[in-house]
């Protein structure tokens, strides 16, 4: 049960995280105009990865796409790439993890296959989360650098009467969405990797496997073949600990290749 819960929770957390990464990538507010020097501006600027927008006090909002590819800063292109790679890996990870979920049975899929798929999706989620966090962090670093550069420019050469206030940009909502979403995807991936360990059948062969059934005498059969209790075969020789204390996962019978759902 613990493994199923960990896997399911990992999937849900990753799903929320990837949805957040997609949302952050599409959002226009990656950087917003810093209002420290002019808190009552009638024109508010904000920028995203794909377009820049201006919201006027009149209520009119105008957005313009970055229709050039070569003219854009290399850092912006890198951030775009990181976010897209994060989304693609996350989407593939989600697809893989759906089939890897313990609660979903597809034909004759072995537990080892599910374990491998869980691990694969977990790694994909981790990389996806790291890509998102890296992308957002690179953009944030770019903002901080530009902010201090424009601040330096703002306070130099102001001997004249006319002030030309340079627009400075600060962190937008998308950055925080991206950081949180990347973190969630990363956590979801780690949970999937942890679940994979619980799913993977142990290779140690035991001479005997005990089956307990109420109202029947306990039958022992070496090799773990079908016993008189009527339980399904346990060809994987699942380790059953002595002492009788077991989790639900440890008691669960596993379907053979002849079982269909």
């Amino acid at each position: 049960m613990a493994v199923t819960a960990c896997q399911g929770l990992g999937f849900v957390v990753s799903l929320i995280g990837i949805a957040g990464i997609i949302a952050a990538t599409c959002m226009d507010q990656w950087s917003t105009q810093d209002l420290y020097n002019n808190p009552v501006t009638a024109v508010f600027n904000y920028q995203g990865l794909w377009r820049s927008c201006v919201r006027e006090s009149s209520g009119f909002t105008e957005c313009r796409g970055y229709f050039t590819l070569l003219g854009l800063p290399a850092m912006l292109q890198a951030v775009r790439a990181l976010m897209i790679v994060g989304i693609v890996l996350g989407a593939i990870g989600l697809l893989v993890s759906i089939f890897a979920l313990k609660c979903i049975r597809i034909g004759s899929m072995e537990d080892s296959a599910k374990a491998n798929m869980t691990l694969t999706s977990g790694i994909m989620f981790i990389v996806s989360g790291l890509c998102a966090i890296a992308g957002v962090s690179v953009f944030a670093n770019m903002l901080v650098t530009n902010f201090w550069m424009s601040t330096a420019n703002m306070y130099t050469g102001m001997g004249g009467m006319v002030q030309t206030v340079q627009t400075r940009y600060t962190f937008g909502a998308a950055l925080f969405v991206g950081w949180v979403a990347g973190g969630l995807t990363l956590i979801g991936g780690v949970m999937m990797c942890i679940a994979c360990r619980g799913l993977a059948p142990e290779e140690t062969n035991y001479k005997a496997v005990s089956y307990h059934a109420s109202g029947h005498s306990v039958a022992y059969k070496p090799g773990g073949f079908k016993a008189s209790t009527g339980f399904g075969s346990n060809t994987k020789n699942k380790k059953i600990y002595d002492g009788g204390a077991r989790t639900e996962d440890e008691v669960q019978s596993y379907p053979s290749k002849h079982d269909y759902v």
Partner: antibody, heavy 120, light 113 residues
Framework: EVMLVESGGDLVKPGGSLKLSCAAS????????MSWVRQTPEKRLEWVAT????????YYLDSVKGRFTISRDNAKNTLFLQMNSLRSEDTALYYC?????????????WGQGTSVTVSS | DIVMTQSPSFLSVSAGEKVTMSCKSS????????????LAWYQQKPGQPPKLLIY???TRDSGVPDRFTGSGSGTDFTLTISNVQAEDLAIYFC?????????FGAGTKLELK
């Protein structure tokens, strides 16, 4: 046709109060940012206050901050300006104005104005 | 606050002439986000409320004759009226539409010679 009709202007003593109203018609009132602009007897134009569309954010001229309150009733298509602690320098013709949606924050429509005189 | 300075205060012209008036702002009215200038020009005839002529420093409002031309960027702006007509005699105001308070210039009064 866009119409802005101001009312409520009067002769009032210093320290007194007055509430101006502006009845709007001919357009979807709730979709526009509205302002009050006054014109002094010397013909100088002075922006007084603005209430934004959507957010309902309000902005005021420093000299009227804390004394004047701009508000709107979208259901009744009406703009208000509550003026308290009136001073002689508030004497002016008060215009109800609409900021154009695509006019770069410029006022595209003005009312005919309502006169406020603050005198003892 | 952004201070708007208009010059000259008075302009005497004859019908058919070309006239130019200036408006200077204490801060730039140019917005880098959309590469636009936030300055408007209004015309006020006696006994009437002001009427929008130009917005965005150079865009004529609908119904405004093409003899009215707005130009300039940043802090220096100009309104030009080519072939002045008798109906153009009025006071012309410029306005900062970039930052609150949305300040106006003192106006330029156009008179007949």
């Amino acid at each position: 046709e866009v119409m802005l009709v101001e009312s409520g202007g009067d002769l009032v003593k210093p320290g007194g109060s007055l509430k101006l109203s502006c009845a709007a018609s001919g357009f979807t009132f709730s979709r526009y940012t509205m302002s009050w602009v006054r014109q002094t007897p010397e013909k100088r134009l002075e922006w007084v206050a603005t209430v934004s569309v959507g957010s309902g954010n309000t902005y005021y001229l420093d000299s009227v901050k804390g004394r004047f309150t701009i508000s709107r009733d979208n259901a009744k298509n009406t703009l208000f300006l509550q003026m308290n602690s009136l001073r002689s320098e508030d004497t002016a013709l008060y215009y109800c104005t609409r900021l154009g949606q695509t006019q770069r924050n410029a006022v595209d429509y003005w009312g005919q104005g309502t006169s406020v005189t603050v005198s003892s | 606050d952004i201070v708007m300075t208009q010059s000259p205060s008075f302009l005497s012209v004859s019908a058919g002439e070309k006239v130019t008036m200036s408006c200077k702002s204490s801060q730039s009215l140019f917005n880098g986000g959309n590469q636009k200038n936030y300055l408007a020009w209004y015309q006020q005839k006696p006994g009437q409320p002001p009427k929008l002529l130009i917005y965005g420093a150079s865009t004529r409002d609908s119904g405004v004759p093409d003899r009215f031309t707005g130009s300039g960027s940043g802090t220096d702006f100009t309104l030009t009226i080519s072939n002045v007509q008798a109906e153009d005699l009025a006071i012309y105001f410029c306005q900062n539409d970039h930052s609150f308070p949305l300040t106006f210039g003192a106006g330029t009064k156009l008179e007949l010679k």
